[in-house]
């Protein structure tokens, strides 16, 4: 339960007047309002949307309310020269090109300024030659072209499906094996449910739309040319050779109408098996090349994007905290879209929207939160988490000693089946003793909570009558806040039913299509699923910022750390000889993590005990837990990524949007079969399992007590 | 066979109302956007109004909207066209056509029915 | 609106002609093109969909081509049957407009 005593603050003014306030038909109108004209980063549209955001902040009470600007690499197209792809003859005329935009949603004939689909920071070039189909463009499916099916990439242009990992993942991919350009596509394998009608008249994606998004490699780096500092007035840029994270090759996206006339010529090696079908009438061949009739046609890329330094614009709004105003909580979302955005992201910044209106009318009223909670609308997150990731770099010193808690709010929704949630263990009871006291807005659950509807829709892989809570990732602006500064960092959202519909994220993901009307129409007309995530979320903040104690308990780490001690040891046993031959022992991992169990233990047992009227003792302890997170980082980086410094965590070096647990060990064991050099690949091993039982130790030791 | 029969037309005041229908047979009627698209004495071809599988979602040409309705009875295979405040300039022959989508051609027709609007 | 095109607006023309009817759009529309065929007394015929695909049934001697705003409806060799008024229409967005159609006749 949260507690308020040293708030000032009539007894009214707790958890349940904060969630009290909070209303679906707010969130609905301030979506409508978020979503009526595109507001991609960088433009007039968006800066406007930046000071609407800021005055109405203001209005709700907010202590102040800041717009905090960068100027940062971003991408757009050539408004006069456009991005296609063609298929050419022998003579080298273009019989096929693929279209240059999406055909306007209902409604939007007359919006101007609809950026064209794209692939944010792609090169220019026009590169022409054989096709090669590579599936997602994994990690594995580039092996087995490679090692099982001898089909070499180099110099071809590579189509691949969208789905499975991040975008960015796949075009690296390609680089490393020599590709000249890539193709991406939405295949209905991914895309398109069974059962449902394509947008305007159900969710799924037309054959004409399109996914944008960028094909960075930041690595958490932030704008590409100025890693590590805030991209401000000042700021020394790197040349555009030197920025960080740049693929190298042309890349552009398409839609699967599209696809179909590149994928039904394709000639060459049969699919190696199922698993590289989609659900086109094509035959999936990989090539290279197209078949016998159509061998001397080939493919050709124009792409002619300008990377531009451009200025973006957070909002940062502040509610100073009553007793701890040096301690933040905070709340945080990005406001820029590829388009309408009525997904991602105005379906989560209507939510803070609304969480904020709910704060301030608690403060007009006179209450003020314990600590100091901290909202912003970040701009340029589909730039590579541009605006977050600058704003804590320009804010670091400060963040890495105040900072509690980040709270993510991107997208609400990516279906309406159940929660969906990601956050470090610190969070796990805090998440669950919430969702026990909200209502669940499922149908079949009326009466029932929030907890029981999704522990029973979502149900923990390791703990019965647990939901499933995951680990997080990155591809949202949470990344710079967990994984760089060590923050413990949470998100939450209403989610599909994974076990039946098995396409990658929702079908109209990053498309035109993105529109009011598709949330309104199809995914929650009552916004029943909306105010369930706002009162997550916002139940989060509040209980973060206002409860004596911090609502975090470090026994959940121990638990994972143990679990993840054991994933990562039976994945190195896979090589019993080798461990052998160079003397690898993770007899130093386990017991740094038995030691972290029973300190935490002990921890607890305190915590419980100690005298919370002593405010220097409750700072003491409070302080222990908010560091607990930051213990984790390790201030060199993870090999090759200064940037992602959590020893625990960071996103996976194959899919940017995975969390990968003890990340160090597991990169130095990815492969290492094939490695030339096995004594040096062994090596490392050795010593990432050294820096990680060296870091639990040391985190371990930051719950002892003090003296 | 696939067979769309309009019916309903006829010479109309200025002024008047008149509703048009449409019997569909020979395919799964809802699986199609249903249109009305009418032709001057004449003239070309002009759309008039579509409607979605389920009746859901209507789209008009600007300048009818206020005056026509379009609906649809999916259980009775049928289509209408409501016309109200009718002009001079609304006489035509009104055929009822069938496309498999909201970006689709219109793959069947009707023999269409004429409406006069004459005082 | 996109405005659509055509011309001619007639054309006059003998059995065993090559007949090109062409049409314009006002926006890019990709491929999403229709063009039908209209016979006196009678109601519009499908030919050609998607720019160039030709609908079940269609004589070969007919075809599409074109993409973004320029397309053409080719009469390989003109039959006694194919005089008619042949419309393009576009179904990129609302409203999908017709061409003011061409008159094939005969010379």
């Known amino acids: 339960k949260s507690s308020n005593e040293a708030t000032n603050i009539t007894p009214k003014h707790n958890m349940k007047a904060f969630l009290d306030e909070l209303k679906a038909e707010n969130i609905k109108k301030f979506l409508y309002n978020f979503t009526q004209i595109p507001h991609l980063a960088g433009t007039e549209q968006n800066f406007q949307l930046a000071k609407q955001i800021q005055s109405q902040w203001k209005e709700f009470g907010l202590d102040s309310v800041e717009l905090a600007h960068y100027d940062v690499l971003l991408s757009y197209p050539n408004k006069t020269h456009p991005n296609y792809i063609s298929i050419i003859n022998e003579d080298g005329n273009e019989i096929f090109n693929t279209s240059l935009f999406e055909p306007p949603p209902p409604g939007y004939e007359n919006v101007s300024d609809i950026v064209p689909p794209f692939s944010a920071f792609s090169p220019q070039g026009m590169p022409e030659g054989d096709l090669v189909y590579v599936n997602y463009a994994r990690t594995e499916d580039f092996f087995k072209l490679e090692r099982d099916m001898k089909i070499n990439c180099s110099g071809k242009i590579v189509i691949a499906r969208y789905g499975k990992v991040f975008r960015g993942n796949k075009v690296k991919n390609a680089q490393l094996a020599g590709a000249k350009g890539v193709i991406l596509y939405s295949d209905p394998a991914d895309y398109f449910a069974p059962g449902v009608k394509s947008y305007p008249d159900g969710w799924n994606l037309p054959g004409g739309g399109v996914q944008r998004g960028n094909i960075l490699n930041l690595n958490g780096a932030g704008d590409p040319l100025t890693p590590g500092y805030p991209a401000n007035e000042y700021a020394y840029r790197r040349g555009i050779a030197e920025a960080v994270g740049l693929p190298s090759i042309p890349v552009h996206p398409i839609g699967y109408y599209d696809a179909q006339k590149l994928l039904e010529k394709m000639g060459g090696s049969a699919p190696p098996d199922s698993s590289w079908r989609g659900s086109l009438k094509v035959p999936y061949n990989v090539g290279p090349g197209f078949t016998g009739n159509f061998s001397t046609q080939k493919v050709k890329m124009h792409i002619h994007s300008t990377n531009e330094v451009t200025r973006i614009y957070n909002v940062i709004g502040t509610l100073r905290g009553a007793v701890e105003p040096d301690r933040y909580v905070i709340l945080g979302g990005h406001r820029d879209s590829w388009v309408f955005g009525g997904i991602d992201p105005q379906s989560g910044a209507a939510v803070v929207h609304e969480i904020v209106r709910s704060f301030g009318t608690l403060k007009k009223e006179g209450w003020r939160p314990r600590r100091t909670i901290l909202f912003a609308s970040w701009d340029a997150e589909e730039f590579g988490l541009l605006g977050s990731t600058e704003w804590a770099e320009e804010n670091s010193r400060l963040l890495q000693e105040r900072g509690v808690a980040y709270i993510n709010a991107d997208s609400s929704i990516e279906g309406n089946y159940t929660l969906r949630v990601d956050c470090t263990p610190l969070m796990y009871s805090l998440v669950h003793n919430l969702t026990k006291e909200l209502k669940s807005p499922d149908e079949g659950f009326e009466g029932k909570s929030l907890y029981e509807s999704w522990t029973k829709k979502s149900p923990s892989p390791e703990f019965s009558g647990m939901p499933r809570i995951s680990k997080l990732g990155s591809g949202n602006d949470f990344e710079v806040f967990f994984q760089r500064l060590g923050i413990a960092s949470g998100r939450a959202r209403y989610t599909k039913n994974w076990e039946t519909n098995k396409f990658s994220g929702y079908p109209l993901y990053h498309s035109v299509y993105e529109t009011y009307e598709l949330v309104e129409k199809f995914y929650d007309p009552m916004f029943k699923y909306h105010l369930t995530v706002a009162q997550v979320r916002g139940g989060m903040v509040f209980e973060l910022a206002n409860s004596i104690v911090l609502p975090f308990d470090c026994r959940d780490y121990a638990v994972v750390l143990r679990k993840y001690a054991d994933k990562i040891y039976s994945i190195s046993m896979k090589h019993p000889q080798e461990m052998k031959t160079y003397s690898v022992s993770f007899d130093s991992l386990f017991s740094a993590v038995k030691n972290f169990t029973e300190i935490a233990s002990k921890f607890s047992e305190r915590l419980q005990d100690f005298d919370k009227s002593n405010p220097i003792v409750l700072r003491m302890m409070n302080d222990q837990l908010m560091f607990l997170e930051r213990a984790f980082i390790d201030p060199l980086g993870l090999p090759d990524r200064p940037f992602y410094r959590h020893v625990i965590y960071a996103p996976s070096s194959h899919n940017k949007y995975a969390g990968e647990s003890f990340p160090g060990i597991y990169d130095a064991l990815f492969d290492i079969e094939s490695k030339v050099d096995p004594s040096k690949a062994w090596g490392e091993v050795k010593r990432q399992i050294y820096v990680a039982a060296f870091t639990v130790q040391a985190a371990a030791e930051t719950l002892s007590e003090v003296a | 066979e696939v067979q769309l029969v309009e019916s309903g037309g006829g010479l109309v005041q200025p002024g008047g109302s008149l509703r048009l229908s449409c019997a569909a047979s020979?395919?799964?009627?809802?699986?199609?956007?249903m249109a009305w698209v009418r032709q001057a004495p004449g003239k070309g071809l002009e759309w008039v109004a579509s409607?979605?599988?389920?009746?859901?979602?209507?789209y008009y040409l600007d300048s009818l909207k206020s005056r026509f309705t379009i609906s649809r009875d999916n259980a009775k295979n049928s289509l209408y066209l409501q016309m109200n405040s009718l002009r001079a300039e609304d006489t035509a022959v009104y055929y009822c056509?069938?496309?498999?989508?909201?970006?689709?051609?219109?793959?069947?027709w009707g023999q269409g029915t004429l409406v006069t609007v004459s005082s | 609106d996109i405005q659509m095109t055509q011309s001619p607006s007639s054309l006059s023309a003998s059995v065993g002609d090559r007949v090109t009817i062409t049409c314009r759009a006002s926006g890019n529309i990709h491929n999403y093109l229709a063009w039908y065929q209209q016979k006196p007394g009678k109601s519009p015929q499908l030919l050609v969909y998607?720019?160039?695909t030709l609908a079940d049934g269609v004589p070969s001697r007919f075809s599409g081509s074109g993409s973004g705003t320029q397309f053409t409806l080719t009469i390989s060799s003109l039959q006694p049957e194919d005089f008619a008024t042949y419309y393009c229409q576009h179904f990129w967005s609302t409203p999908p407009t017709f061409g003011g159609g061409t008159k094939v006749e005969i010379k």
């Open positions: 998607n720019a160039e």
């Open positions: 056509a069938g496309s498999d989508g909201y970006w689709a051609w219109f793959a069947y």
């Open positions: 409607i979605n599988y389920d009746g859901s979602s209507t």
């Open positions: 020979g395919f799964t009627f809802s699986d199609y956007y």
